[in-house]
Interface confidence: low
């Protein structure tokens, strides 16, 4: 029972990751204009994602434009985009192995396969979590860089805005479902003889391995 | 309709002083920013200063801070450019700019422009 | 400071030719703080493209904009005598901001 829920437990932390991931690539909340220094001339807020641009003006208004050409668009940008788009779809494919692969259902019976294919999506959702954190971590930091840069006008300055945060947060997310995943794998075990007076099949992952439950934690 | 109108310029002699004036009207001008521009034929176009909507905060590129000021008044929809230890390379025509509605701090609006000569 | 050179400072075309004038900058400029400006003999500038593409007001759709990093472009798909001027690229991406020299663009 232990493995199953670290199973639940695991999947339900990726789902709500690849959701995070999601709206956090979708939200033009990346870099968020930053009112600070003497240079603002502007009574606005400009907020920019991966997508598109938008612009609150200080009556509430808000216009969003979407960015017009992909080769007009700076490398880091695009290269973000490419980065979120690949974790979401290797997030759900990890989320659909681990489906197949999970004690609760049937699409695969061997207890050896399952206990295979649960790994391997624990690795997948790993890997998607870290490809969510190189876009979120490079934009921060350049964001943090300009911030500091004496040399950047202080209108052009950027925040960090609320899609960095529930990025960073999406990949914990995915990492720590994918991390669970791995973890209900059990160790390799010597298969112990089956005593004809004991009639149990050889132990199976659900709990009943033989091992205290002290060494799962 | 969006109109700027600058006024002041005229020749002075170097190290006098002068105050340029931008009457604006056509839009509500407490709502945007405003930028001083000057342009000579040898320099071409250079930003002097810019100011926030309500005057709290104002920019000076480093190469004209220190000699010039600007400032404004919303109640009379009036941008002004004090213009101090002026010298010869300051001889130039002034625009003032508006930075009406988009995204990325591009002037939208200019003015006719004022004339400064400074020369003895 | 970022340094725009425009090129070719002077250029003269013919009425419906094809016209491209460059801009580039002396270290990569971001795409959304870009601008450009006409300017005619006797006035004032006007906005005429911002954010590196997007026409402003008014402005027909025979000129366009393009470019990132540090190479930008604006064109005329089909050169109309209207379009004699001089175009300004400017930046606002590192103070301070600058303009560049100037492209004065002549009916052949």
């Known amino acids: 029972m232990a493995s199953t829920g670290l199973e639940l437990l695991g999947m339900t932390l990726a789902v709500l990751g690849w959701l995070g991931t999601l709206v956090s690539c979708a939200l033009p909340l990346w870099k968020v204009t930053a009112f600070i220094g003497n240079s603002i001339v502007v009574a606005q807020v400009v907020w920019e994602g991966l997508w598109m641009s938008c612009v609150v003006q200080s009556t509430g208004q808000m216009q969003c434009k979407v960015y017009d050409s992909l080769l007009a668009l700076p490398q880091d940008l695009q290269a973000a985009r490419a980065l979120c788009v690949i974790a979401l779809l290797l997030a759900l494919l990890g989320l659909l192995v681990a489906i197949t692969g999970a004690q609760c259902t049937t699409c695969v019976e061997d207890e050896g396969a399952k206990a295979r294919i649960v790994l391997t999506a624990g690795v997948i959702l790993l890997l998607a979590g870290i490809l969510v954190l190189i876009p979120v971590c490079w934009t921060a930091h350049a964001i943090i860089q300009d911030f500091y840069n004496p040399l950047v006008a202080e209108a052009l300055k950027r925040e960090l805005g609320a899609s960095l945060y529930l990025g960073w947060a999406a990949a914990a997310l995915l990492m720590l479902g994918g991390g669970l995943l791995c973890c209900t794998c059990p160790p390799p075990q010597v298969e112990r003889p089956r005593g004809p007076r004991l009639g149990y099949s050889i132990p199976s992952r659900s709990g009943a391995s033989g091992l205290d439950k002290r060494d799962y934690v | 309709e969006v109109q700027l109108v600058e006024s002041g310029g005229g020749l002075v002699q170097p190290g006098g002083s002068l105050k340029l004036s931008c009457a604006a009207s056509g839009f509500t001008f407490s709502s945007h920013g405003m930028s001083w521009v000057r342009q000579t034929a040898d320099r071409g176009l250079e930003l002097v200063a810019s100011i926030n909507s309500n005057g709290g905060r104002t920019y000076y590129p480093d190469s004209m801070k220190g000699r010039f000021t600007i400032s404004r008044d919303n109640a009379k929809n009036t941008l002004y450019l004090q213009l101090s230890s002026l010298q010869p390379e300051d001889t130039a025509l002034y625009y003032c700019?508006?930075?009406?509605?988009?995204?990325?701090?591009?002037?939208?609006?200019w003015g006719q422009g004022t004339s400064l000569t400074v020369s003895s | 400071q970022i340094v725009l050179t425009q090129s070719p400072a002077i250029m003269s075309a013919s009425l419906g030719e094809r016209v491209t004038m460059t801009c580039t900058a002396s270290?990569?400029?971001?795409?959304?703080?870009l601008h450009w400006y006409q300017q005619k003999p006797g006035s004032s500038p006007k906005l005429w493209i911002y954010?590196?593409?997007t026409l402003a007001s008014g402005v027909p759709a025979r000129f366009s904009g393009s470019g990132s990093g540090t190479s930008y472009s604006l064109t005329i798909s089909s050169m109309e005598a209207e379009d004699a001027a001089t175009y300004y690229c400017h930046q606002y991406h590192r103070s301070p901001p600058t303009f560049g020299g100037g492209t004065k663009l002549e009916i052949k």
């Open positions: 954010t590196t593409s």
């Open positions: 700019a508006c930075y009406y509605d988009n995204t990325y701090y591009a002037m939208d609006y």
């Open positions: 270290s990569s400029v971001s795409s959304s703080s």
